[in-house]
Amino acid sequence: LSTCKTIDMELVKRKRIEAIRGQILSKLRLASPPSQGEVPPGPLPEAVLALYNSTRDRVAGESAEPEPEPEADYYAKEVTRVLMVETHNEIYDKFKQSTHSIYMFFNTSELREAVPEPVLLSRAELRLLRLKLKVEQHVELYQKYSNNSWRYLSNRLLAPSDSPEWLSFDVTGVVRQWLSRGGEIEGFRLSAHCSCDSRDNTLQVDINGFTTGRRGDLATIHGMNRPFLLLMATPLERAQHLQSSRHRR
Amino acid sequence: LSTCKTIDMELVKRKRIEAIRGQILSKLRLASPPSQGEVPPGPLPEAVLALYNSTRDRVAGESAEPEPEPEADYYAKEVTRVLMVETHNEIYDKFKQSTHSIYMFFNTSELREAVPEPVLLSRAELRLLRLKLKVEQHVELYQKYSNNSWRYLSNRLLAPSDSPEWLSFDVTGVVRQWLSRGGEIEGFRLSAHCSCDSRDNTLQVDINGFTTGRRGDLATIHGMNRPFLLLMATPLERAQHLQSSRHRR
Amino acid sequence: ALDTNYCFSSTEKNCCVRQLYIDFRKDLGWKWIHEPKGYHANFCLGPCPYIWSLDTQYSKVLALYNQHNPGASAAPCCVPQALEPLPIVYYVGRKPKVEQLSNMIVRSCKCS
Amino acid sequence: ALDTNYCFSSTEKNCCVRQLYIDFRKDLGWKWIHEPKGYHANFCLGPCPYIWSLDTQYSKVLALYNQHNPGASAAPCCVPQALEPLPIVYYVGRKPKVEQLSNMIVRSCKCS
């Protein structure tokens, strides 16, 4: 490549590589790489790999193009996930089974363990594995609001599909609210979109984690892939803007 | 300002101004400024000023942050508007008045006059002037699809307000469809959001252009502010990438 | 668009996204990032000629504005347009962490 | 953020948005744009020091990355971040036209 003077491509690459070295450490607020001396031998734990893969995969309904980032978003976000409370929990008994809705509840103590302060949360996604779907379906997501009232959050038009597909809903504001409140269990409802004059309001879509009568081994796989909240948050110690170069726990 | 060498701020400003001179002409695909010899004397026509002001004003539901622009969006877009067919037109008689919906129809010949080819359309917004609203209302926008079916487009949660406020819905895809089809009249429906188990589905919001029994002079003002489509499109002659520097009409 | 599809398959001399794969171990001498082993960072490079729109040149330069100086800058510069995040897995002591690093992968460039 | 709020009220030497009002008649010698009479175009200016993260400087430079070289560029550059469109009214012959020009007003800058 040449302009007035020839560009030394190798020098540019070296400068870019050096800049990336600093960029990664700076995003993690590390003054030096963490020592690997105490890393357990063997492959990464299954749960960690699953979490990494969840983060890496773009899913339906997630924007591929990042917005210009606010300053706070420059720094790395720790990724954790909180699985939905299993469907045999008594909380589900309070909500009548209906043809137009499914319910998903989450333990807020688990959320608080992952994100101790609401302000640390930068993104929360509700991820659902939808199984194959024969017809187009318009679904709506609601948040449990008070005793028996639900607040509309968002909607999605699901195209027919022969293969399972992850869906993602941005629920950052809702999870931030939950972290600020004192509740123990909080939840979402996924419903068929009901038009004012339409009669057929059945939820056709099959979400992994709700179908029954499975073979034991299948049920386990099924349970692992049940709805979850994928959380991205600034670790507490990083948020404290420690001037020290410590790698705190 | 200084880096290694002092920056000549005046030179930078001059270069920026010169670049803007070229940028504006280039965005309009003009090789030179248009002659003003035939410009009618006096102020700009009311309708032109109204259109200019509509374009200038940011409205509720419109994103303030531009997306990275595709190449085609570099060039200037001509702005036009097409008013909704007035409510005394017979087309409205076919749709039963209901408490949960209002209907807005548009003449596609007017749309085609403004945008001769679907591909030229870069943005279409449905703009509605909502009058004061006492309670929060969740509304949905539908597109007339076939004889008596409606296709869901989008929704908006309207906060209570003491003053009128313009609402904007992005309906680019829909208008592009209409321009491709042969229909004479096409329309939208604004409805209250109906939950599957909720009973109160009344559309509380009052949209300018639908309320009746007004004093004559008020009705005229009211009619001017009735729902309209704000269209941004590449003018046909600009799209043809003429190499000549002609100012085609 | 000056994206990977166009730039990686052309010999564009002007502003374009250029290929760069970073192998954490080889390029940075790091063994602490467990996943991924490396990533396509890429970078933007190439001139964005400043266009003097002096009257004598109008007709020649107008068509070049879109590519070379769409923002009418006094000194246009080849910079990233679309960026993507990078999730990583690393250990702090005995504890594995998954973190997402924003804006790490350059997908396209622009003159700005 | 390096936006008009911060930059117009500070004496920031590094990358920032700088004030520039374009009066169509005075600055460009144009009388053909009927509305507006001019606009706040603004521009980006100021150095974005390249940060060599050589080992000796680690602790000093890490905090500077966010501002000066967040994209880890080999040659960071001060460019527009947030831009806004400009609608104009002009005549072609006897016919008035309202046109929207995208990305004309610089609201904030960034090192990229």
Epitope: A31, P33, G37, E237, R246, H247, R249 | - | K31, R94 | -
Partner: antibody, heavy 118, light 107 residues
Framework: EVQLVQSGAEVKKPGASVKVSCKAS????????MHWVRQAPGQGLEWMGR????????RYAQKFQGRATLTVDTSTSTAYMELSRLRSDDTAVYYC???????????WGQGTLVTVSS | DIQMTQSPSSLSASVGDRVTITCRAS??????LNWYQQKPGKAVKLLIY???VLETGVPSRFSGSGSGTDYTLTISSLQPEDFATYFC?????????FGQGTKLEIK
């Protein structure tokens, strides 16, 4: 100010045991591992082991496995190192040191001289 | 275990001198090399970690360099308070191991 303050010098007979304490202040005790390092007269430094005050997890250098015992009392932010079956070559200055995950000891105690002599 | 060999074991120098101490590891330690200063009756003090990162509060006359197995501590202009014993330590692989130390004395 981050500080580690160790107990005073001890003189022990061979075969006896010694317990050295290390009181931490100025930081969250459970956020860092505590390590123990010793230095025999005129010799270099030798790593003995570490304890994680949060989980109670312990790791010893092979040489001290079975003879050293590391404990913590989180209520008083104190770490302890007990060495049993003392021999004369255990005569040394024993240090507690706070470990940073970057791979270094960033804060050290002042040291406790343990003399093993019959 | 990784062996750390430090040299010289002792060194005489004058105020204002430039002094270099080296440390060699028995295998690649990926820059996880730290330097400490020890004075009689005082707590051990961290000077440099990860080869070249100066600990907060340490004067800039101290610097570190190296990679792979070979590392260096340099004091650019000796000050009276710098006369002490210096140790290197690897933080790459358990068990953590130290060099034998370099005693820096006044000439």
């Amino acid at each position: 100010e981050v500080q580690l303050v160790q107990s005073g010098a001890e003189v022990k007979k061979p075969g006896a045991s010694v317990k050295v304490s290390c009181k931490a202040s100025g930081y969250t005790f459970t956020s860092y591992d505590m390590h123990w390092v010793r230095q025999a007269p005129g010799q270099g430094l030798e790593w003995m082991g570490r304890i994680d005050p949060q989980s109670g997890g312990i790791r010893y250098a092979q040489k001290f496995q079975g003879r050293a015992t590391l404990t913590v009392d989180t209520s008083t932010s104190t770490a302890y190192m007990e060495l049993s079956r003392l021999r004369s070559d255990d005569t040394a200055v024993y240090y507690c040191a706070r470990w940073d995950y970057g791979g270094y000891f960033d804060v050290w105690g002042q040291g406790t001289l343990v003399t093993v002599s019959s | 275990d990784i062996q750390m060999t430090q040299s010289p074991s002792s060194l005489s120098a004058s105020v204002g001198d430039r002094v270099t101490i080296t440390c060699r590891a028995s295998q690649d330690i990926y820059n996880y090399l730290n330097w400490y200063q020890q004075k009689p009756g005082k707590a051990v003090k961290l000077l440099i970690y990860y080869t070249s990162v100066l600990e907060t509060g340490v004067p800039s006359r101290f610097s570190g360099s190296g990679s792979g197995t070979d590392y260096t501590l340099t004091i650019s202009s000796l000050q009276p308070e710098d006369f002490a014993t210096y140790f290197c330590q690897q933080g790459d692989t358990l068990p953590w191991t130290f060099g034998q130390g370099t005693k820096l004395e006044i000439k």
